[in-house]
């Protein structure tokens, strides 16, 4: 009988955690350097070795004396019954061909958990159990006592299970949920005694796989590879994950470090082609993804260096750059951006190998700029690097405008008293600080004698003393590199303040909408001139140029203010500079109620009636247009006399009301009245909003008809 | 009878280091989850530490993470409580508990730890 | 961490009585919630644990409920024997943590 090849030496070890049956055998009558491919058919049984509840071939190469080992992973727990083991083994393979036969079993290797148990009455299994949500689980209880009728609860819900032998019961839970990071509770208890025993599942949420994972390298010397690793387990200590990159070209596998990124060294040998695994494991599972790209193609260049904007004139200036080197024959495409107050104002593209540079053109002069720079590969766009970022000003330029100017003229004392006021350039004209204002005075009853005023920034005006004669003023604004063009405006022997009449007008939210009548004559412009604080005695003068087809302009400001009256005066600008007034017109943005009632003196007392008067009050004082008087009058008579009506108070009291509705009468004749009779009186302004404050009434009562006898 | 026994406390000074040691009998000890949880007097119940049956997982009170070590010996049936760089704010009575799952349904009968200098 | 909120300090019925103690949870912690008793100078017992189920030994005048986050211990027909602190417990997110605790005062 040919020799036969068994197994032998067969040893089966627990490892109860994991429910492993651990199996290790070795073949003794192999020659001495034979190696051959043989299976072991491996029989389990449960309980009693009749009942074989797994069968399986395990086909592996033997030498002699080598051990070989083999694991199964048990659904019951191993503690909830007796398992049995045995094998045979035959040679399959083509050397030999007359061993293909099985040899005989070996002996049953028997496993029993149960009999290295404490003697506790009861005891569930398994213990620690960790597995994923979905998953099926079979639990058991062993019990040492016959006559307890034991229960078991799942999360406080009775479970209803099959028994295995009189002392066992085994309960399938199938699709177990995830419940929370404490795990799942199972109890058991006895129904007599006080016998209880609990256990915990630990049902993890499923193990996700890695999410967008990519590569790049910076420098074609290292890859860094990312990902988003999948959501959290639900578990506090159980479940940690490993994850492994390997490179099926090169065969190289590293272990990472980090759950999100891994480097990766770049292969001296010009590898160009790269076929990556990430493999994300813990002790439930592993999740794969794969990524395939050539190098060249995922190169996200460093950010550009030695950045340096040169030549910086008031127009122009010149940013260079070097970049990082991303092989020898790559061209990077490099991108500028221009910012001027926080936008954007110029873009532009260009291709570098090593060096770059860019003008940039058109630029205001005395402004701070940030120019910004970023380079990505020209050839396989994968990333932009990041910004590099340099900040600079502009040189100055002379200014470009001329100073707004405007002016006040007074007579005093037989001179002329010029008041110049000037707006300061705003930021685009000034083209750098504005350092002095010179005011020449023309004097143009005799052109040759001129007179320079030099004027430090940042005054916005002066005072200037002329005699009777005509002068035409040319102011300039001046910074460190030039001057300004010339604002000219004229001023003549003649104030100008001729009389005109006073318009009113309504004013908005919008403002004061203004118009004039055009000016037959030749006419350069018009100047609208008002004072932001009326009767303050600095006045915060303010004027609009307009040019000379305009008839109609709306002022605005934030400083106006409802109850404050505004004057305007509109001024036309001759050929010669010189402006004359044309129109006033005074209103309100807004109008109030009377502040306050006038004072009112009562005469010509007699029987039947008596005269009010009142004085004229500064109407410029009062938030809104006086437009009448009312005159309240109470007695005790019970019908209103003529040209009165019945009012009512706020307090209520009835009285009677005349309308007086001429905002120039000052007088006031109450006739009618009763001999010896008592009356109240109170008179208050209105304006198109309302009347004034309620006062005090002021009481009288006329005499008898006999008393001046 | 089912019964836990906490080794003698005791005053200690701030800084110092002491072991506590609670001794099971009456059950098979390796069969249950086991527990330390303290009590300053007149307040309430805290959790200190927790371990599985055979040692291999523990799960603490976060701030006392890094100075008390919980473990267990299942020869001997004894749980243990190392605990350092001890603070006045560890004075309490320190309980062992075997846990059914994570509630605990035996407790021994307390020791008391004073940290004071 | 889950902060478990018993708002009655002390609690005053009379024999006979019944008496609900109550527990709040500061977030869903489902039913892994436990309810301890201890008498003046003794420690802890377990009454209840997975919010409603009695413990082996526990006089059935103990009754447990609720879920999510609030939570009740109900003794109907109080004993003397009963006058003790009582305390909840909730696991079902580490840490482990209990109420500050209810005591039972007879009238």
């Known amino acids: 009988e040919p020799l036969s090849l068994a197994p032998e030496s067969l040893e089966v070890s627990i490892d109860s955690a994991r429910q492993c049956l651990h199996l290790k055998w070795s073949v003794h009558n192999l020659a001495y350097h034979q190696e051959l491919k043989m299976v072991f058919q491996i029989e389990i049984s449960r309980i009693k070795t009749s009942n074989v509840i797994w069968v399986e071939n395990y086909s592996t190469t033997v030498k002699r004396n080598q051990v070989l080992r083999w694991s199964w992973e048990s659904k019951l727990p191993l503690e909830c019954a007796k398992h049995s083991v045995r094998m045979r083994g035959a040679v399959d393979d083509a050397q030999v061909p007359e061993l293909r036969f099985w040899s005989n079993w070996t002996s049953w290797e028997e496993v029993d958990v149960q009999s290295s148990l404490g003697h506790d009455p009861l005891f569930v299994f398994p213990k620690d159990k960790l597995v994923e949500e979905g998953s099926n689980v079979t639990i058991c209880y062993v019990s040492r006592s016959h006559q307890n009728n034991i229960s078991c609860y799942l999360e406080g819900v009775r479970m209803h299970g099959e028994q295995l032998d009189p002392n066992v019961c085994v309960f399938h839970l199938k699709n177990v949920p995830f419940i929370r990071e404490t795990g799942t509770n199972i109890y058991c208890k006895a129904d007599q005694g006080d016998v209880i025993k609990g256990i915990v599942l630990f049902v993890s949420k499923v193990f996700e796989e890695p999410k967008d994972f990519s590569c790049e390298t910076r420098d074609l010397k290292t890859l860094n590879c990312t990902w988003a690793p999948g959501s959290d387990a639900g578990l506090l200590t159980q479940l940690s994950q490993s994850y492994t990159l390997f490179e099926s070209f090169s065969g190289k596998k590293t272990l990472c470090k980090y759950k999100s990124w891994c480097n990766w060294q770049v292969s001296p040998d010009s590898q160009e082609m790269y076929n990556f695994t990430l493999t994300a494991e813990n002790y439930l599972r592993k999740r794969s993804v794969h990524l395939l790209f050539n190098l060249t193609h995922r190169v996200h260049p460093m950010a550009p260096f030695n950045v340096f904007v040169k030549n910086v004139s008031a127009t122009n200036a010149t940013m260079t750059w070097k970049v990082h080197s991303i092989g020898n024959y790559s061209t990077l495409l490099c991108q500028i951006e221009l910012y001027g107050e926080g936008k954007v104002i110029q873009k532009q593209n260009v291709s570098v190998k090593v060096n770059g540079k860019h003008l940039m053109k058109k630029l205001e002069p005395s402004t701070e700029y940030a120019a910004q720079v970023r380079c990505a590969n020209a050839n396989h766009f994968w990333k932009w690097s990041e910004w590099t970022r340099r900040n600079f000003t502009t040189a100055e330029a002379a200014p470009s405008e001329a100073p707004d100017v405007w002016r006040n003229v007074k007579s005093v004392q037989g001179h002329c008293v010029v008041t110049l006021f000037w707006k300061p350039l705003s930021k685009l004209q000034a083209n750098g600080k504005i350092l002095f204002y010179n005011v020449v005075l023309e004097n143009l009853d005799r052109p040759s004698t001129l007179k320079l005023l030099s004027i430090p920034a940042p005054a916005n005006g002066t005072e200037l003393t002329l005699d009777r004669c005509s002068y035409q003023i040319h102011v300039t604004a001046n910074n460190s590199v030039g001057t300004s063009p010339a604002s000219v405006i004229a001023v003549s022997g003649d104030p100008g303040n001729k009389e005109v009449e006073e318009e009113r007008v309504k004013g908005t939210e919008d403002g004061f909408c203004l118009s004039w009548k055009p000016q037959p004559g030749d006419v350069t412009g018009y100047v609208v001139e008002w004072c932001e604080r009326p009767g303050d005695p600095l006045c915060d003068l303010q004027w609009k140029n307009l040019g000379p087809n305009t008839t109609s302009t709306v002022v605005s400001s934030d400083a106006f203010r409802p109850g404050v009256r505004y004057n305007f005066r509109i001024y036309g600008i001759s050929t010669e500079r010189i402006p004359y007034l044309l129109e006033k017109k005074t209103g309100y943005s807004q109008e109030l109620v009377p502040s306050d009632n006038p004072q009112v003196l009562m005469s010509n007392l007699t029987s039947y009636s008596f005269t009010l008067s009142w004085k004229d009050y500064a109407a410029e004082s009062q938030p809104g247009f006086v437009q009448g008087y009312s005159l309240y009058l109470k007695s005790k008579a019970a019908r209103c006399l003529p040209g009165s009506e019945k009012a009512v108070l706020s307090d209520d009291s009835i009285c009677c009301k005349y309308k007086i509705d001429n905002p120039k009468q000052k007088t006031f004749v109450v006739e009618n009245l009763q001999p010896a009779s008592f009356y109240e009186f109170f008179l208050t302004p209105y304006t198109s909003v309302g009347e004034g404050p309620q006062g005090a009434f002021t009481k009288v009562t006329t005499p008898d008809e006999y008393s001046h006898i | 009878e089912v019964k836990l026994v906490e080794s003698e406390g005791g005053l200690v000074q701030p800084g110092s280091s002491m072991k506590l040691s609670c001794t099971a009998s009456?059950?098979?000890?390796?069969?249950?989850?086991m527990a330390w949880v303290r009590q300053v007097p007149e307040k309430g119940l805290e959790w200190v530490a927790n371990?599985?049956?055979?040692?291999?997982?523990?799960y603490y009170l976060d701030s006392l993470k890094s100075r008390f070590i919980i473990s267990r010996d299942n020869a001997k049936n004894i749980l243990y409580l190392q605990m350092s760089s001890l603070k006045s704010e560890d004075t309490a009575t320190y309980y062992c508990?075997?846990?059914?799952?994570?509630?605990?349904?035996?407790w021994g009968t307390g020791t008391t730890v004073t940290v004071s200098s | 961490d889950i902060v478990m909120t018993q708002s009655h300090k002390f609690m005053s019925p009379s024999v006979g009585d019944r008496v609900s103690i109550t527990c709040k949870a500061s977030q869903d912690v489902d039913t892994a919630v436990a309810w301890y008793q201890q008498k003046p100078g003794q420690s802890p017992k377990l009454l209840i644990y997975l919010a409603s189920t009695r413990h082996t030994g526990v006089p059935d005048r103990f009754t447990g409920s609720g879920s999510g986050t609030d939570f009740t211990l109900t003794i109907s027909n109080v004993q003397s024997e009963d006058l003790a602190d009582y305390f909840c417990?909730?696991?079902?997110?580490?840490?482990?943590?209990f109420g500050a605790g209810t005591k039972l005062e007879l009238k």
């Open positions: 508990a075997r846990g059914l799952t994570w509630d605990f349904d035996v």
């Open positions: 371990i599985n049956y055979d040692g291999s997982s523990t």
């Open positions: 009456g059950f098979t000890f390796s069969d249950y989850y």
């Open positions: 417990q909730q696991y079902s997110r580490f840490p482990l943590t």
